[in-house]
């Protein structure tokens, strides 16, 4: 006899990276007929939802109207059908951004390079942090972690046109509290001797749509829960 139900899926909308004082919804999808969902935060019960009518609902949404550092961390959810509880979902890392300061991102030898050249990004932040994150806009899996007292370097090695795109960096005060994003740096790679038509360019956004990027970059992953444990989340573990 089955002692537990299958684990639910958990994800954040519009994004797991949430600017402080902004809203986020944590979604938990279980089974039709579930009479109660529980959202747990860092091992403690955070919220409860009892869908009505349960037989017609297989997903609940927990709304956080005002993100802050106290709510940044790891979430999981469970659900109950009758007296039988599910396995816990995978962990969702919820990150608060726009904390404290703004780092500076630079690139060497420059933003316009030839394919095959070695490129290094430098992220600098003069406040108390030793961990830095470099994100390539367009795909949340393009996240690198670096360390340094006030600056971290991110060597990309010999680049190809696949490295083209817009980059930003964050300083990380802990795994779940990040700085404001840096200003964007757009890397242009030209002269690839390979077939450049086979090297798709990530979608990039002008600087003023970074907010929109944060709201949309997870969308594809959230629609396919099997992909939810993606690199950006795993990087936080």
């Amino acid at each position: 006899q089955q002692q537990t139900l299958p684990k639910p899926f958990i994800w954040a909308e519009p994004h797991f990276m949430v600017p402080k004082e902004k809203q986020v919804t944590i979604c938990c999808q279980g089974n039709y007929g579930a009479v109660e969902y529980q959202l747990h935060f860092e091992g403690s019960l955070f919220a409860v939802d009892r869908p009505k009518p349960p037989e017609r609902i297989n997903k609940v949404q927990f709304y956080i109207p005002d993100m802050n550092s106290r709510m940044a961390g790891q979430y999981s959810c469970i659900y109950r059908v009758g007296e039988l509880w599910s396995e816990p979902s995978n962990l969702l890392d919820l990150v608060v951004t726009e904390m404290y300061d703004t780092p500076t991102l630079s690139v060497h030898p420059g933003p316009e390079v030839i394919s095959g050249e070695k490129v290094t990004f430098y992220c600098r932040l003069d406040t108390a942090t030793s961990m830095f994150l470099l994100l390539k806009e367009g795909r949340s899996s393009h996240v690198q972690r670096g360390y340094g007292k006030v600056q971290a370097e991110f060597p990309l090695g010999p680049v190809t046109t696949a490295h083209r795109g817009t980059y930003r960096c964050f300083g990380s005060y802990n795994n779940h509290a990040w700085s404001f994003p840096s200003e964007p740096v757009k890397l242009l790679v030209t002269g690839d001797i390979e077939n450049t038509s086979l090297a798709p360019e990530d979608p990039t956004f002008p600087a003023d749509t970074w907010g929109t990027y944060l709201l949309t970059t997870e969308t594809g992953l959230q629609k396919d829960h099997a992909l939810w444990d993606h690199t950006a989340q795993n990087l936080l573990r």
Epitope: F46, D49, R50, P65, R70, M71
Partner: nanobody, 126 residues
Framework: EVQLVESGGGEVQPGGSLRLSCAAS????????MGWFRQAPGKEREFVAA???????YYAESVKGRFTISRDNAKNTVYLQMSSLRAEDTAVYYC????????????????????WGQGTLVTVKP
């Protein structure tokens, strides 16, 4: 901006009853999930009871069957009816709100709440 004002605290004997009230200012009360927390001297603030916009409730194990949370949207007020009071119920009781939220969300963790009252003292002693 939401302001919360608690009332109804006082001194009561063990086994007695009290009803706490929390009056909320503003027109956002109907879109708020509400909760009661308490803090005893020298202890951390702990969850007592919560109620969703749609009147779903959740209680701490220690008060289940003794305390009842309810709300009156017409009066912008949430209540905590406390009966069979014990010495260990002695604490400052705080009302809190999550504004806005979805209809059936019940919040248990204090970090979720974005508005707090100043508290009212409940003392249970012979």
């Amino acid at each position: 901006e939401v302001q919360l004002v608690e009332s109804g605290g006082g001194e009561v004997q063990p086994g007695g009853s009290l009803r706490l009230s929390c009056a909320a200012s503003g027109r956002t009360f109907a879109s708020a999930a509400m909760g009661w927390f308490r803090q005893a001297p020298g202890k951390e603030r702990e969850f007592v009871a919560a109620i969703s916009r749609s009147d779903d409730t959740y209680y701490a194990e220690s008060v289940k069957g003794r305390f009842t949370i309810s709300r009156d949207n017409a009066k912008n007020t949430v209540y905590l009816q406390m009966s069979s009071l014990r010495a260990e119920d002695t604490a400052v009781y705080y009302c809190a709100a999550v504004v806005p939220t979805y209809g059936s969300n019940i919040y248990v963790h204090s970090a979720a709440y974005n508005y707090w009252g100043q508290g009212t003292l409940v003392t249970v002693k012979p």
